[in-house]
Interface confidence: medium
């Protein structure tokens, strides 16, 4: 705790300016009025204060606003934001996207800190849903943001926001997250024509069910192996050799390089070997000719 000491004569700050960098910590505490600091927060960022001096300025604001800072102050925190704890941030009510952008800018280039995570959480909860502008902003600063959300949180994303999502934003999403996002994407892009639709939907296909993959195989889409390898195994297994051949087009030959990896490995095990042989790729491991295939899941359903 910085002890209360009287401000030396002639040192009382009339405005926030560079002369304050020469003040000792106790002088800043004694000579800078908290209300003045609050109204001139925008100047703090332009002054090369030390970390210790920033601690004093934060302390002054904490005293002035024990219930949490107003947004007019938050928007101009700049590097002082890095001094805030998640507990401090939980007291804030941030409603302006401009304020959010200003604070994210301070942390730009770094991993998402607990402070930033708390800020985003407060902002999104305050808005009630993850709207397009917010999603645009968050994924611009943190491409992995979307995949850091739980399936439950993702369910609050309106389909209109899906337009803001770029392929790299989905790189770290797991199948459960894509299961939630795919139907929203399908809805968002439903009015697009064939090739344009496929360009937009392909990044979400890790959540696509078998029937949608079968439909795509009829549309001459020529899916790249990179996309095929991200499909749900349970969605790929029921596809026939002919359907996979149509789905991949010229990329079907890439199955050979991926035959030991899921979902290709598991799909091969479900196909008749003579069907696989028609591809001419030397894929091995299919059901030998003459064997009877029992669908046990169907059997269980009947018993």
């Amino acid at each position: 705790e910085v002890e209360k000491t009287a401000c030396p004569s002639g040192k009382k700050a009339r405005e926030i300016d560079e002369s304050l960098i020469f003040y000792k910590k106790w002088e800043l505490e004694a000579c800078v009025d908290a209300a003045l600091l609050a109204t001139q927060m925008d100047r703090v960022n332009a002054i090369p204060f030390t970390y210790e001096q920033l601690d004093v300025l934060k302390h002054k604001l904490d005293e002035l606003y024990p219930q949490g800072y107003p947004e007019s102050v938050i928007q101009h925190l700049g590097y002082l934001f890095l001094k805030m704890s998640p507990e401090d941030i939980r007291k804030w009510n941030v409603t302006s996207l401009e304020t959010l952008k200003a604070l994210l800018e301070v942390n730009k280039g770094h991993e998402m800190s607990p402070q930033v995570a708390t800020l985003i959480d407060r902002f999104v909860k305050g808005r009630g849903q993850l709207d397009k502008d917010t999603l645009d902003t968050l994924t611009a600063f943190y491409p992995g943001y979307l995949c850091s959300l739980s399936p439950e949180e993702l369910s609050s994303v309106p389909p209109s926001s899906i337009w803001a999502v770029r392929p790299q934003d989905l790189d770290t999403c797991d199948p459960r997250q894509l299961d939630v996002l795919y139907p929203k994407a399908r809805l968002a892009f439903q009015n697009m024509n064939g090739s344009e639709y496929f360009v937009k939907i392909q990044s979400f296909l890790g959540g696509a069910p078998t029937e949608d993959l079968k439909a795509l195989s009829q549309q001459n889409v020529s899916m790249d192996l990179a996309t095929f390898m991200k499909l749900r195994t349970d969605a790929v297994l029921p596809l026939t050799v002919a359907e996979v051949q149509k789905l991949l087009g010229p990329h079907v030959e890439g199955l050979k390089a991926e035959e030991r990896h899921r979902p290709v490995r598991d799909w091969i095990l479900r196909q008749r070997q003579d069907d696989l042989d028609t591809l001419g790729l030397g894929l091995q491991g299919g059901i030998p000719n003459g064997y009877l295939v029992l669908d046990l899941s169907m059997q269980e359903a009947l018993s």
């Epitope: 770029r166 990044s203 790249d224 010229p250 990329h251 030959e253 001419g280």
Partner: antibody, heavy 115, light 110 residues
């Protein structure tokens, strides 16, 4: 080891056509795509189109649509690329390449278009 | 007609590490695999990397590929004089259903 051997250099007049061949040996021909890629003098690589012999159908880069025809003869393991309405800017080395990852390339065929 | 963007040239001293970038879009590099080719003067291109980061047998492990979002890069470590060549990135474009190349990058070993 897969080998692709292309036909020899050609000199053509503007407005005419050229047909370049690419004979494959040492691997399955029918199930792997053959692409044609060209390179103008001092320029980069430009994909023209591809065919999968056992599919029978070819697809082409938009730039060459209507002017290029890619065919394949499975009995001789040979792919062909025919380019029509030649102009001087079609002067280039034309390569055939096998597979979606272009793992094997022909030696190239220089086509010169000059009046 | 060049869909993927590469720097026209890069250079490095023997033994150094250089990287070549390749920038595309959400219809090509974004969801698809990237390949890299080396073309020595007067010869046909040679496959260096496929599937973003896989090296065919015979390609030295000094060459490595990576991809992030709609960009990819080729890194060459322990630069040697025989690495002086043109390097091309290539991907598949869903929108046009065609293969696309970068404009090429000339690597000079100083």
């Amino acid at each position: 080891q897969v080998q692709l051997v292309q036909s020899g250099a050609e000199v053509k007049k503007p407005g005419s056509s050229v047909k370049v061949s690419c004979k494959a040996s040492g691997g399955t021909f029918s199930n792997y795509s053959i692409s044609w890629v060209r390179q103008a003098p001092g320029q980069g690589l430009e994909w023209m189109g591809r065919i999968i012999p056992n599919f029978g159908t070819a697809n082409y880069a938009q730039k060459f649509q209507g002017r290029v025809t890619i065919t394949a003869d499975e009995s001789t393991s040979t792919a062909y690329m025919e380019l029509s309405s030649l102009r001087s800017e079609d002067t280039a080395v034309y390569y055939c390449a096998r597979g979606i990852y272009f793992a094997f390339w022909g030696q190239g065929t220089l086509v010169t278009v000059s009046s | 007609d060049i869909v993927l963007t590469q720097p026209p040239s890069v250079s490095g001293a023997p033994g150094q590490r250089v990287t070549i970038s390749c920038s595309g879009s959400s219809s090509n590099i974004g969801p698809n695999y990237v390949s890299w080719y080396q073309q020595l003067p007067g010869t046909a291109p040679k496959l260096l990397i496929h599937g973003n980061a896989n090296r065919p047998s015979g390609v030295p492990d000094r060459f490595s590929g990576s991809k992030s979002g709609t960009s990819a890069s080729l890194a060459i470590t322990g630069l040697q004089s025989e690495d002086e060549a043109d390097y091309y990135c290539q991907s598949y474009d869903f929108f046009t259903n065609s293969s696309v190349f970068g404009g090429g990058t000339k690597l000079t070993v100083l």
